[in-house]
Interface confidence: medium
Amino acid sequence: QEFLLRVEPQNPVLSAGGSLFVNCSTDCPSSEKIALETSLSKELVASGMGWAAFNLSNVTGNSRILCSVYCNGSQITGSSNITVYGLPERVELAPLPPWQPVGQNFTLRCQVEGGSPRTSLTVVLLRWEEELSRQPAVEEPAEVTATVLASRDDHGAPFSCRTELDMQPQGLGLFVNTSAPRQLRTFVLPVTPPRLVAPRFLEVETSWPVDCTLDGLFPASEAQVYLALGDQMLNATVMNHGDTLTATATATARADQEGAREIVCNVTLGGERREARENLTVFSFLGPIVNLSEPTAHEGSTVTVSCMAGARVQVTLDGVPAAAPGQTAQLQLNATESDDGRSFFCSATLEVDGEFLHRNSSVQLRVLYGPKIDRATCPQHLKWKDKTRHVLQCQARGNPYPELRCLKEGSSREVPVGIPFFVNVTHNGTYQCQASSSRGKYTLVVVMDIEAFSSH
């Protein structure tokens, strides 16, 4: 008769470092002491007729255990295979690029250390919860890669690596380990440079708006903008509208920046940069300044009028040009009554990069002269009808402007000048029209002949 030696449990599965209770039993009636052969740490727990129980501790790797016993002088054996499973010690997704261009491939890399049995270990690369790649864990450490085409939708998406130790066939379930997620930042930066709108010329101490625009940028809110006039950084206000970025600044030129300069606009996103440059000439254009040797001159005095402007500026005073750019234009005159209120015009021209810039300035001369009454405007003999409406059209001139009064001789009767009044026979007579100012008096005699109203 053949007797058997049973080993229980048969082909068990346990977690790494665990313990196992093993029972060896035989139906042989005359068996000797049962022995357990194993490289593992073992301890006889109990034994009896035809059976022995052992405890195996700190089981770290797969092993085969063998029970043997002598039965009627011949050896019988039984065996069991222990399968040990262990979760990976480390699951790590390698860092992603700081910025990834949309439309270009990038590589996801996951490294897995430990985990057994390897035949049951799978490595999964994920975007959100979407599986991108599923591969067996091959070497130790297992290194799994997947190539991903970056899209706009990937901006801010978490990528992770998951291990699956499938012990379901052994009735133990699916053990999942997941790496810390890593977030991807994707971007689009067009190859075209920004559009830079800036003045060609900028006068010292003046301000002008500068605009820099770039379309097709993603994410526009993450872009950095640098606007500068030469080495002077401009304080830009940046606005985003969809995929368009607009930076606006005010450029103010300093005196030390005079000459050929550049306005620069840099847009940086994802570690890449797009740049636009525009040439600009900073110029200084002083004047023109028109001066009178005497702003208020006495009649008959000599007045000098001069016009000056900055270097390289050509000035022309009342049609008379200065000898050369940068020089002063001058003219002299004997002040007369007719020069009072006269304006002297100076035009200045500056050439900047082949373009001519023009400026004008003027000054008005005051000439002081005594009062006069213009005979042409003040008739000396007036024939008016009684009970009619008339205006005494007399005008005085002088600087300072004189006061004009017309008084009837022999009385203090005054007729209004320049405004309508009703004439009657009492107005008949001779009038002294006198213009007076701080510079003297001027008198003109006016006779009013009033024809009485006749009723038939």
Epitope: E92, A94, T107, R109, Q111, P117, R118, T119, Q135, P136, V138, E139, E140, P141, E143, V144, T145
Partner: antibody
């Protein structure tokens, strides 16, 4: 063109150390694994170990653990192998090679560096 | 370690002949993922080894179709349908299923 350029021959004294280098070009250095192989007259080709330039992780043939140290310098796309406590047994030609994850074969090899250990 | 045994040690051939090299492993080279990581390399005189065949039967880019690989488990073969002068050198088989990776001792293909 993918190339692995190794440093020139070395003549070293017993007990000394030597560091040989392998500069990669024509591909993304961190995308492939670098392996080192020894070829000596008596023993044919022997695999020393491998290094993943991206993670810097290494796997050694136990026979060469303590003898060889593998490192990489990502900034210059260069792999290094230092051999220490040299004896005449270490006289050989040492090759660097690369492999992709799949196929798991050494698809490109360096030209080899001859190391002679002699007093 | 997986010990790789190549036969013959030397293979004298005439140009245009067929040649066959055998490689046997001391353990199965089938990985738990189902792939078999057995590769063939050629080392021409004074040169570094170069990859011919990877994973039993896949020709590496630029390798002529007169080279073919076959086999499974522990027994593998490299065949050359028509030997040309540029094929002369030492042929090595190698496995990367198990760490450490190991190589065969080499087969020298030479002219009769």
């Amino acid at each position: 063109e993918i190339q692995l350029q190794q440093t020139g021959p070395e003549l070293v004294k017993p007990g000394a150390s030597v560091k040989i280098s392998c500069k990669a070009s024509g591909y993304s250095f961190t995308d492939c694994i670098i392996l080192w192989v020894k070829q000596s007259h008596g023993k044919g080709l022997e695999w020393i170990g491998k290094i993943n330039p991206y993670f810097g992780t290494t796997t050694y043939n136990l026979k060469f653990k303590g003898k060889a140290t593998l490192t990489v310098d990502k900034s210059s796309s260069t792999a290094h192998m230092q051999l220490n406590s040299l004896t005449s047994e270490d006289s050989a030609v040492y090759y660097c090679a690369r492999k992709e994850a799949y196929p798991d074969a050494m698809d490109y090899w360096g030209q080899g560096t001859s190391v002679t250990v002699s007093s | 370690d997986a010990v790789m045994t190549q036969t013959p040690l030397s293979l004298p051939v005439s140009l245009g002949d067929q040649a066959s090299i055998s490689c046997r492993s001391s353990q199965s080279l089938v990985h738990s993922n189902g792939d078999t990581y057995l590769h063939w390399y050629l080392q021409k005189p004074g040169q570094s080894p170069q990859l011919l065949i990877y994973k039993v039967s896949n020709r590496f880019s630029g390798v002529p179709d007169r080279f073919s690989g076959s086999g499974s488990g522990t027994d593998f073969t490299l065949k050359l349908s028509r030997v040309e002068a540029e094929d002369l050198g030492v042929y090595f088989c190698s496995q990367s299923t198990h760490v450490p990776y190991t190589f065969g001792g080499g087969t020298k293909l030479e002219i009769k």
